[in-house]
Amino acid sequence: CKAMHVAQPAVVLASSRGIASFVCEYASPGKATEVRVTVLRQADSQVTEVCAATYMMGNELTFLDDSICTGTSSGNQVNLTIQGLRAMDTGLYICKVELMYPPPYYLGIGNGTQIYVIDPEPCPDSDF
């Protein structure tokens, strides 16, 4: 028996508006009805929780109102979007999936998505 497998892309480049999206897919060993998804960021030997959501299979992911994350779920796939990113937010973003209910509990952790964020150049002053 091994840890639950979680797949996510290796690299994502955030848009010029500071938005990055990626898919987190997990191989569920059972028929989970309640799933918790957490996005963690590892950078400079620090680990921080970016956002987390618990959802019932077939329902929408609900993040806290002040969360920088949004997402949708489809089967064993979660489509995650992180907003408001700046260059200093560049780092490894890890998808953690926990099958909460029904028992048994399972934990899976992806290998991380390196998100690169480039701050846009300020627009030059225009005479027009």
Partner: nanobody, 127 residues
């Protein structure tokens, strides 16, 4: 799936020793990092130590006093606690995390990466 059960807590005198054990069932320990964590009343849960196939890592507060080890044949992880201090008093938890290539010595013990938490065992250091 992994199931963890810890044992070995209790009362110890300052300067004394205790050994905690964490038994795993349902899976081999090999693909997992096993960590020990503790939580004192009114404080956040904090890392004590963790171990994977080839590395160990310790919180600064326990370095030189606590030793973590694992016996893969018995599916057991141990925490030998020596030179105990009153500030070591807490509920101690064992937990597991899938071992990942991006874990560093500084991050492999981070509680955010863990699951399969045990119920906890009380360790009290008092004269």
């Amino acid at each position: 799936e992994v199931q963890l059960v810890e044992s070995g807590g209790g009362l110890a005198q300052p300067g004394g020793s205790l050994r905690l054990s964490c038994a795993a069932s349902g899976s081999t320990l090999d693909p997992f990092v096993i960590g020990w964590f503790r939580q004192a009343p009114g404080k956040e849960r904090e890392t004590v130590a963790c171990i994977n196939r080839s590395r160990t890592s310790y919180a600064d507060s326990v370095k030189g006093r606590f030793t973590i080890s694992r016996d893969n044949a018995k599916n057991m992880v141990y925490l030998q606690m020596n030179s105990l201090k009153p500030e070591d008093t807490a509920v101690y938890y064992c937990a597991a995390s899938p071992d990942k290539p991006f874990y560093t010595d500084q991050t492999m013990c981070n509680k955010h990466y863990y699951g399969y938490w045990t119920q906890g065992t009380q360790v009290t250091v008092s004269s």
